[in-house]
Interface confidence: low
Amino acid sequence: QETELSVSAELVPTSSWNISSELNKDSYLTLDEPMNNITTSLGQTAELHCKVSGNPPPTIRWFKNDAPVVQEPRRLSFRSTIYGSRLRIRNLDTTDTGYFQCVATNGKEVVSSTGVLF
């Protein structure tokens, strides 16, 4: 999993997130809960939850096996929730298994969490 994390991190330059906290004492970004692993069956629906909070409100991106997750109409979607973001995959196929990672940023910091769908 370390490979996955390090490659995905290339998408998110960190240099601008090392600015002194004095610049904005009110900003924060927290991973509230590690992402859940999911075991499910073919044809079923799976949901992965990215639970983060922050100020400014974080932007959340999803990756599968290091590639940006691309939404598929009526089958694979992600949306903002009050706790962060939810990724939903309907009509599961064997090709859907893999490492899923959410990366959240508030423009100054970044947090990420990885879950496995198998």
Partner: antibody
Framework: QVQLVQSGSELKKPGASVKVSCKAS????????MHWVRQAPGQGLEWMGW????????KFNHKFDGRFVFSLDTSVSTAYLQISSLKAEDTAVYYC???????WGQGTLVTVSS | DIQMTQSPSSLSASVGDRVTITCQAS??????LIWFQQKPGKAPKSLIY???SLANGVPSRFSGSGSGTDFTLTISSLQPEDFATYYC?????????FGPGTKVDIK
């Protein structure tokens, strides 16, 4: 460092086939998608699809179904694009690119002419 | 398919100029947009991910903005090495689609 090195230019006749290779180094091939992108002479970029070396799964742009095949030889960290029944309009530079489009091959020019 | 349009299709500018290129998606793509630079005979190079995040090693004179359907790439002070063609790419839905490109040449 990460590198994608593609095979050299090809000149083919209409109806023939061609196989373009993309050799990856400096990272783990099997945990990264490999995209293929086409650029016709003087034209823009077109996403053809990807192959996931972890399990061989592929995803195609519907414009490239049928005559186009993505394949792999993970033992030599190489991805391949094969085009059959070549047409003049297949003349283009073909690029491979890693998962996040952060690293690209240098491109392979395929010319189809009688 | 999601259609991507860019404007202008070409522009002439001088070193030191501020240059703005826009990309419009035919439907909401959130922030799922990458900007690329391509020079003649070379592979594209990524500049901006997620519409606004600077890729590794890219000079800070490049910046991206926008979300939803309207996006902008700005070069704050054009340098000689910036004369090239710029493309946007959406990765919200399959098939991934590129904009037609904007060529930036010397005035």
């Amino acid at each position: 460092q990460v590198q994608l090195v593609q095979s050299g230019s090809e000149l083919k006749k209409p109806g023939a086939s061609v196989k373009v290779s993309c050799k990856a180094s400096g990272y783990t091939l099997t945990t990264n998608y490999m995209h293929w992108v086409r650029q016709a002479p003087g034209q823009g970029l077109e996403w053809m699809g990807w192959i996931y070396p972890g399990n061989g799964n592929t995803k195609f742009n519907h414009k490239f179904d049928g005559r186009f095949v993505f394949s792999l030889d993970t033992s030599v960290s190489t991805a391949y694009l094969q085009i059959s029944s070549l047409k003049a309009e297949d003349t283009a530079v073909y690029y491979c690119a890693r998962s996040d489009f952060d690293y690209w091959g240098q491109g392979t020019l395929v010319t189809v002419s009688s | 398919d999601i259609q991507m349009t860019q404007s202008p299709s070409s522009l002439s500018a001088s070193v030191g100029d501020r240059v703005t290129i826009t990309c419009q998606a035919s439907q909401d793509i959130g922030n799922n947009l990458i900007w690329f630079q391509q020079k003649p005979g070379k592979a594209p190079k990524s500049l901006i991910y997620f519409a606004t995040s600077l890729a590794n090693g890219v000079p800070s004179r490049f910046s991206g903005s926008g979300s939803g359907t309207d996006f902008t790439l700005t070069i704050s002070s054009l340098q000689p090495e910036d004369f090239a063609t710029y493309y946007c790419l959406q990765y919200r839905e399959y098939p991934l689609t590129f904009g037609p490109g904007t060529k930036v040449d010397i005035k």
